[in-house]
Interface confidence: low
């Protein structure tokens, strides 16, 4: 069974998938469509790297621009380094500026909804 066929079989269960499952899927050439991606749990999507999302979505990564103001894409963008977002070539804006450090202060992030940044 190839990646696309496997994805079709598990598609209906993906809404509640944890980050670990999404990371594993990104290695299996599944080409997740954007409608499915948009239904994923925000907390599961946030830890994914730009490279992992690119592999997870395949050709559909080019549709992220259309969803950049909607969750979970909006929140995921806020967690990525702008340099990394730029590699997608989609004009996605709102990433962490170059030279900033991201502090994993989970409590503050839970309260504010955004990561804590330290300037350069």
């Amino acid at each position: 069974m190839n990646g696309s066929e496997y994805f079709v079989k598990i598609q209906s269960f993906l809404g509640g998938a944890p980050t670990e499952d999404l990371k594993a899927l990104s290695q299996q050439n599944v080409s997740m469509d954007l409608a499915t991606f948009m239904k994923l749990r925000t907390d599961a999507v946030l830890p994914l790297t730009v490279a992992e999302v690119q592999k997870l979505l395949g050709p559909h990564v080019e549709g992220l621009k259309a969803e950049e103001r909607h969750r979970p894409v909006r929140d995921w963008i806020l967690r990525q380094r702008q340099d990394d977002l730029d590699t997608l070539g989609l004009g996605l804006q709102g990433g962490i500026p170059n030279g900033y450090l991201v502090l994993d202060l989970s409590m503050q992030e839970a309260l504010s909804g955004t990561p804590c940044l330290l300037g350069p």
């Epitope: 080409s31 050709p59 559909h60 549709g63 259309a66 590699t87 070539g89 004009g91």
Partner: antibody, heavy 120, light 107 residues
């Protein structure tokens, strides 16, 4: 409005190379990958590959990996495709088309195409 | 690679008729299919995306349907300007692939 300007014809000799251009206007050039499609006379469409206008990254159809080289010039909002070691099999119309533009998947806009004729 | 098969190379119809152009994918592509119309000497024109959504400006007599592996482009009340070749395309996975095309002829 979106416009994609391509030269009408190119006449080249077997074994030579040719560089085709696609001048884009009417949208933010760096926001959408530019793709290239081949159509031989009286035949169907073949996807050659796409290029990321932000950083020049490419994604090729394996069939064309050694035949085509895709590049971009952000300053002139132009995408180029160089075809090398030309044979009669390369005689075709070549189209450029941005993907996922206007938040819609697929190729909503196409250039007029460049007819390449390989003839000794 | 995913192969998109349009088994009918030619279809003949009369003005005002309803015609269905079919396309079959070699594996499940969900609804990640687009349809294009190409008139002689012109660039392809996008008609349908995501299997069933019309691009803006496309007449509502063009309707797309299907999911998984089987897709249909239906043209109702065929007009003389619909004389063209129609291609399906999948964008579910790389490489992006097109069907071989179906030429619509008006009787």
């Amino acid at each position: 409005q979106v416009q994609l300007q391509q030269p009408g014809t190119e006449l080249v000799k077997p074994g030579a190379s040719v560089k085709l251009s696609c001048k884009a206007s009417g949208y933010t050039f760096t926001t959408f990958w530019m793709h290239w499609v081949k159509q031989r006379p009286g035949q169907g469409l073949e996807w050659i590959g796409g290029v990321n206008p932000t950083n020049g990254g490419t994604n090729y159809n394996e069939k064309f990996r050694t035949k085509a080289t895709l590049t971009v010039d952000k300053s002139s909002t132009t995408a180029d495709m160089q075809l090398s070691s030309l044979t009669s099999e390369d005689s075709a119309v070549y189209y450029c088309a941005p993907h996922y533009i206007s938040s819609r998947p697929g190729f909503a806009y196409w250039g007029q195409g460049t007819l390449v004729t390989v003839s000794g | 690679d995913i192969v998109m098969t349009q088994s009918q190379k030619f279809m003949s119809t009369s003005g005002g008729d309803r015609v269905s152009v079919t396309c079959k994918a070699s594996q499940n592509v969900g609804t990640n299919v687009a349809w294009y119309q190409q008139k002689p000497g012109q660039s392809p024109k996008a008609l349908i995306y995501s299997a069933s959504y019309r691009y803006s400006g496309v007449p509502d007599r063009f309707t797309g349907s299907g999911s998984g592996t089987d897709f249909i482009l239906t043209i109702s009340n065929v007009q003389s300007e619909d004389l063209a070749e129609y291609f399906c395309q999948q964008y579910n996975s790389y490489p992006l692939t097109f069907g071989g095309g179906t030429k619509l002829e008006i009787k």
